[in-house]
Amino acid sequence: LPAQVAFTPYAPEPGSTCRLREYYDQTAQMCCSKCSPGQHAKVFCTKTSDTVCDSCEDSTYTQLWNWVPECLSCGSRCSSDQVETQACTREQNRICTCRPGWYCALSKQEGCRLCAPLRKCRPGFGVARPGTETSDVVCKPCAPGTFSNTTSSTDICRPHQICNVVAIPGNASMDAVCTSTSPTRSMAPGAVHLPQPVSTRSQHTQPTPEPSTAPSTSFLLPMGPSPPAEGSTGD
């Protein structure tokens, strides 16, 4: 025959524990029901009556099965540099996270206590390590053959446009400008055309040389790309 199911409250067998979603009440010395998430214990159990639960009031919550006498207060409203990613309900606390373009400089158990704006890398510098929810952007100088012409927390150094005949050599903060030779253009052959905004192009060129294989000066125009200042963080 199957064992008889005990209804709360009940006295546990010596050495055994209460079942799931039950707790042992020291005063009553009985196994009693826990309250479900979104509720709290209004009246504790006795030897003859089970726990009486009640719903959490506005701006309070319980996230777990519990027997707390009062629900927990939801955190304060999110600040202007934060977004509410989880609303305060009877079953969960409000969670504030940093809005796009910011990172969490000081975190708490859930969400963020203090947000800070992500560093923007200035022209001539690109993102070496992107910002995350909890870490700032790291900038690096654009190496020879690459550039960044934006002040941005997301743009990396891009390779210069590939030119066979260069009108203006690129540098750390500017793309190369090619000499146009295409007769389909409205300008005269040999005229200079500025490149399209970089975002519209998939291609670029000229990578960074190895220190041991820097290009010989026979390749360089008098005005070669100048390396960015050392030691600058770009913020």
Epitope: I156, R158, T181, P195, T205, F219
Partner: antibody, heavy 122, light 115 residues
Framework: QVQLQQSGAELVRPGTSVKMSCKAS????????IGWTKQRPGHGLEWIGD????????NYNEKFKGKATLTADKSSSTAYLQFSSLTSEDSAIYYC???????????????WGQGTTLTVSS | QLVLTQSSSASFSLGASAKLTCTLS???????IEWYQQQPLKPPKFVME???????STGDGIPDRFSGSSSGADRYLNISNIQPEDEAIYIC?????????????FGGGTEVTVL
């Protein structure tokens, strides 16, 4: 010294796809473009495209757009060429190569892999 | 359109001087090109970069007997005292950004036989 080691020969069925690799060593992988070139007997060399692993920038020959996909894995210094919807026309030797560095003109390719032979046959 | 034109084959006597031609499309006559050598069953090898003024820089391990020169849209690869090991296909290549789109093209190649 600079080396580009390509994956072995492939025999595949028409309609399938293939991914070949090119492992670079002897230089900083992220600083140089890697190009891919196709060679069929009697057709000469045909540039497919290239990739700058430092930021995954790519160039494609218009003819191979939609057919070829170039990728690179910085952690293993390996470039990949994937060819899809294969036909007998894709049977060829495929070379990877490193584009030379100069700061002014568009440079060609100074180091080449040994080539991967692709045969598409049912 | 960026085009390179080469003659398909050429024969030279051992020890003679050879001059191979690569012709750029007329509107690209000022362009810098590259020469490659491809020996049978081997990948191409970079020989030199050749500019419109004839100045050139050769690749690693290329013998001094290889030189370059230019005239108008023609780019020449000169081989003095040609040797049996110079027997190969010589291919020219050129790249540029045209209308914001990068292209790299190869010539058809000239097959060199040393008699």
């Amino acid at each position: 010294q600079v080396q580009l080691q390509q994956s072995g020969a492939e025999l595949v069925r028409p309609g399938t796809s293939v991914k070949m690799s090119c492992k670079a060593s002897g230089y900083t992988f992220t600083n140089y473009w890697i190009g891919w070139t196709k060679q069929r007997p009697g057709h000469g060399l045909e540039w497919i495209g290239d990739i700058f692993p430092g930021g995954d920038f790519t160039n494609y020959n218009e003819k191979f757009k939609g057919k070829a996909t170039l990728t690179a894995d910085k952690s293993s210094s390996t470039a990949y060429l994937q060819f899809s919807s294969l036909t007998s026309e894709d049977s060829a030797i495929y070379y990877c190569s490193r584009r030379r560095f100069t700061t002014i003109v568009a440079p060609g390719f100074d180091y080449w892999g040994q080539g991967t032979t692709l045969t598409v046959s049912s | 359109q960026l085009v390179l034109t080469q003659s398909s084959s050429a024969s030279f006597s051992l020890g003679a001087s050879a001059k191979l031609t690569c012709t750029l499309s007329s509107q690209h006559s000022m362009y810098t090109i590259e020469w490659y050598q491809q020996q049978p069953l081997k990948p191409p090898k970079f020989v030199m970069e050749l500019k419109k003024d004839g100045s050139h820089s050769t690749g690693d391990g290329i013998p001094d007997r290889f030189s370059g020169s230019s005239s108008g849209a023609d780019r020449y690869l000169n081989i003095s005292n040609i040797q049996p090991e110079d027997e190969a296909i010589y291919i020219c290549g050129v790249g540029d950004t045209i209308k914001e789109q990068f292209v790299y093209v190869f010539g058809g190649g000239t097959e060199v036989t040393v008699l």
